[in-house]
Structure formats: C-alpha cells, structure tokens
C-alpha cells in the first residue's frame, strides 16, 4: 500500500474554504484521519475530519472563516497534512505546501433564472458565489443545455471566454422542455479546475403561434 496509488488533492474556493480529498489503497474504512492546515503567514491553524466518500476515499472542508471573507492571498502558502490515528499517536501520511491561487475550484454558479423566453430562444442569467474580488473579470464559463431525449454528456459545451453572467440560447424548438447548467473557472492557477456544474434550471420555450413562426 505504501507504494500504491494514494492521492492527496485540495482546492481553494478563492474565499474561505479549502476542500480536500485523500485516497489510500488498502486503508481501513474506520481509520480516523484529518487534514491539518498550517499557513506560513497567518495566525490561525485549521483542522477538519476526513469522512468516507467511497471505499478508499475520504473528504473534508477546511472552513477558514465567514463564507465571503478573503482568508488567503496569492502570496500565501498553506502546509496541508493528512494525519491518521495509529494506536495512541497520529501518523503523518501526506504533506504538501499548498499555493491556494494555483489550486482554485470555485463554488458552482447560483441564482440561475430565465430572463426572457421565446419560441426559439431563451435568455438566462446567473451569479457567481464566494468568488474572490482578486479575479476582477478574469473568469470563464462553460454552459450546456439538455434537450429532450439526450443526456448531459451528449450536450455540446458553450464556452464564454469572459466574465459574462448571462447567455442567449438560440435555435431552440418551440414548446419544448429544456434544462440548463453553467460552471465557472478562473484563468489563474496551474492546477485550477472547473467548478461543479450549477443546479439545473428547467425552462420551456413558448409554443409557436398558429400560422406563423416567431
């Protein structure tokens, strides 16, 4: 197991949360483990208990403060350790010097709403949640629309290469039920990844007027 495929992956949501996943082949499910955060230039330390999410995978969230507080900056380094109890002592299983703004994953966009809907198009807006003001406008979005008879995986991705919190979907079919999702990613960070997809927004296009197509 020591030479197995263990992984220790963490992401910063850009404000006050570091989420970590620890996976360890051959580990006992009831092993008690935690993540400890030790910043290089802050007075606080933080710990969270790793809870099982699958057979050999555990996760936890380091809550650094109020959700919208800016707890870390681009110059911060946070040493993250996985500690597991072995008998009466804690054993260090993994260590990394974590650069928060190189490992970003924002919260999923929220407050999706239909601004205007017609027979063939729909204008949708959303908001970003708990995103640092440091990004200014340096964000990008991906969106997808679920059409009847298709899966999310089949939906083509629409890319918005700027901080644009709305989209106008076109060439839709009249009187049809759709679902829409969006996700966000900062441009900054070597290991930065996409946010989770937003909760789906369901909407229905208007029926075509009798005798004409609007």
């Amino acid at each position: 197991a020591v030479n197995g495929t263990s992984q220790f992956t963490c992401f910063y949501n850009s404000r006050a949360n570091i989420s970590c996943v620890w996976s360890q082949d051959g580990a006992l499910q009831d092993t008690s483990c935690q993540v400890h955060a030790w910043p290089d230039r802050r007075r606080w330390n933080q710990t969270c208990e790793l809870l099982p999410v699958s057979q050999a995978s555990w996760a936890c969230n380091l809550i650094l403060g109020a959700p919208d507080s800016q707890k870390l900056t681009t110059v911060d380094i946070v040493t993250l350790r996985v500690l597991c109890r072995e008998g009466v002592r804690w054993r260090v299983m993994a260590i990394q010097d974590f650069k928060p703004f190189e490992n970003l994953r924002l919260m999923a966009p929220i407050s999706l709403q239909v601004v205007h809907v017609e027979t063939h198009r729909c204008n949708i807006s959303w908001e970003i949640s708990q995103a640092s003001h440091y990004f200014e406008r340096h964000l990008e979005f991906e969106a997808r629309t679920l059409s009847p008879g298709h899966t999310w995986e089949e939906a083509p991705l629409l890319t918005l290469k700027q901080k644009q919190e709305w989209i106008c979907l076109e060439t839709l079919t009249p009187d049809t039920q759709y679902e829409f999702q969006v996700r966000v990613k900062p441009l900054q960070g070597e290991f930065t990844t996409w946010s989770p997809w937003s909760q789906p927004l369901a909407f229905r296009t208007k029926p075509a007027a009798l005798g004409k197509d609007t």
């Epitope: 197991a1 020591v2 030479n3 197995g4 263990s6 992984q7 220790f8 360890q24 030790w38 290089d40 380094i77 040493t79 350790r81 996985v82 054993r91 260090v92 299983m93 993994a94 260590i95 990394q96 010097d97 974590f98 650069k99 190189e102 070597e190 290991f191």
Partner: nanobody, 127 residues
Framework: QVQLVESGGGLVQAGGSLRLSCAAS????????KGWFRQAPGKEREFVAA????????DYADSVKGRFTITRDNAKNMVYLQMSNLKPEDTAVYYC????????????????????WGQGTQVTVSS
Amino acid sequence: QVQLVESGGGLVQAGGSLRLSCAASGRTFSSDAKGWFRQAPGKEREFVAAITWAGRGTDYADSVKGRFTITRDNAKNMVYLQMSNLKPEDTAVYYCALNPEGVIGPYFRNSNRYNYWGQGTQVTVSS
C-alpha cells in the same frame, strides 16, 4: 523540460559527512516536491528523502532518519542532502528527482511519482 544535476559525491570514511547538491533548471512548477533516491550495485532504486516546495515538510526513509537532512533554496533552484554519520551501507549512486504534484509522505515514496531525474552522483563509504 527540466534538468537536474547532482554534485558533491565522493569517497568518505565511515562516520564521515558529505553534502550533496542538486541544481534544477528549465521548466518550473508552481509547487513541486523534490527528493533524493539511491541505488546500490545489484539493488533496486530506493527512496532516501523528500521535501515540499516551500521546505515546510520533509520525509525520510527509516534507514537515514536522524542522520540525513534535506533542504532546499528556491531562490537558487537548489536542493541539498546533508549526510552525516555515514555507513558503508550508504554506498550508492544518489539521484535527485522532481515530483510536480508536490505531495510527499510515506505513501508517496514510489519513484514512479517522480517525473524528472538527474544523472546521479556516486557516494562511497569505506569502512
């Protein structure tokens, strides 16, 4: 690409000390870990020590714990291995290696995790 060049090896008597250096150049990673491995004649390459990007975390093989110290100087792109109280069984070619993921610890000692390697420097400890 990444280039790693080791130096500082040599012949030393048992109980003596050596300091190995590793100079890194080329592509940089935002938070890599660096480590030292060694390979004695007829044996497999084995983990010796590793250090996190900012040097705030270290990991050592049980066989060298308390005798070897790994440090790094990011301003100079250097990693060092201070070896004290050397034993004949420390005789090997010592390799510097880089792990872009930046995680170290007992479950991260496999050489497969290290993507970039130096050519090695010979350390011989005579009794």
